[in-house]
Interface confidence: low
């Protein structure tokens, strides 16, 4: 069964900056990745970035840089300052659309007691929805 993992960490060098990393553990080819915060995409969450293998990457504030890390994982850096900046308990969600598995989404947030620059290893987060 495919799984999605989500890792959130606060950067030690810029304490109000977050890095979100997400990956897809499946055999299908990924056609789209959507990163949102405040809840799952389409369920009250706000889209931060959309990564398409062929059409490129689109991102919206406070997303600072989205990129493909590997063929099945992405990372996103969030701007740390301003009214729309994330707080420690913000939920981030990643949705992977793949063929033939369909859409798989998981969410994660900063570990409650994490020190800046530290985070748990990227383990599969609970799968919220498989379309």
């Amino acid at each position: 069964t495919p799984e999605v993992w989500v890792q959130v960490r606060m950067e030690a060098t810029e304490l109000s900056s977050f890095t979100i990393r997400c990956g897809f553990l499946g055999s299908g080819s990924i056609s789209l990745v959507t990163v949102s915060w405040g809840g799952p995409n389409g369920a009250g969450g706000t889209t931060l970035a959309v990564l398409h293998p062929e059409r490129g990457i689109r991102q919206w504030a406070p997303a600072r840089q989205a990129r493909w890390e590997t063929q099945s994982s992405i990372s996103l850096i969030l701007e740390g300052s301003g009214a729309s900046s994330p707080c420690a308990n913000t939920t981030f969600c990643c949705k992977f659309a793949s063929f033939p598995e369909g859409s798989w989404e998981a969410c994660g947030s900063l570990p409650p007691s994490s020190d800046p620059g530290l985070s748990a290893p990227p383990t599969p987060a609970p799968i919220l929805r498989a379309d």
Epitope: E11, T13, E14, S17, T19, S29, P53, E54, G56, I57, R64, Q65, R67, W68, E69, T70, Q71, S73, I77
Partner: antibody
Amino acid sequence: EVQLQQSGPELVKPGASVKISCKASGYTFTDYNINWVKQSHGKSLEWIGYIYPYIGGSGYNQKFKSKATLSADNPSSTAYMELRSLTSEDSAVYYCAREDKTARNAMDYWGQGTPVTVSS
Amino acid sequence: DIQMTQSPASLSVSVGETVTIICRVSENIYSNLAWYQQKQGKSPQLLVYEATNLAEGVPSRFSGSGSGTQYSLKINSLQSEDFGSYYCQHFWGTPYTFGGGTKLEIK
């Protein structure tokens, strides 16, 4: 005008370390990745890694993970690459290059290159 | 890692001719590919990004095409300033890798 100015040629002894600099001008330094690329004499190009100056985040080619350390000093808009435990295999020209996020990560501006010669 | 195989390795051509350089990739990179030109003793220069888009200031005699695992760079009506080496590079996840290069020489 965007420019990447690299430090001058280096002649170093085997086993030593060297730190190459790449000073950026003409754009907001923290907005773009700086990549480092190796070119041995008469050979192709090898990607070493990138640094994202805004948070100091970096990504490496595993082949160079134990050889190179990338860093950046934002106030001076300068990226650095330190190469350690040098051998003759490390003799090459090293380039820094800006990664253009609007051009699907292609490297749109390059430094002039820093030749490194490892010799006893 | 993704492997990039460029062909031919070298090419001897005359001014005014048309040349095509091929870059074969070990897996689908979804057009996440760039082409660079490098002249002797100089830094590489970006020619094409996203497989088909010409970089700023690049003459229209250059064109990029391809998708999936095969890409090509075409140079129409070759000029004397076009001689040098050409490299493809993918950006579909790290490590970004370059092709082995194609050396374009004057016949």
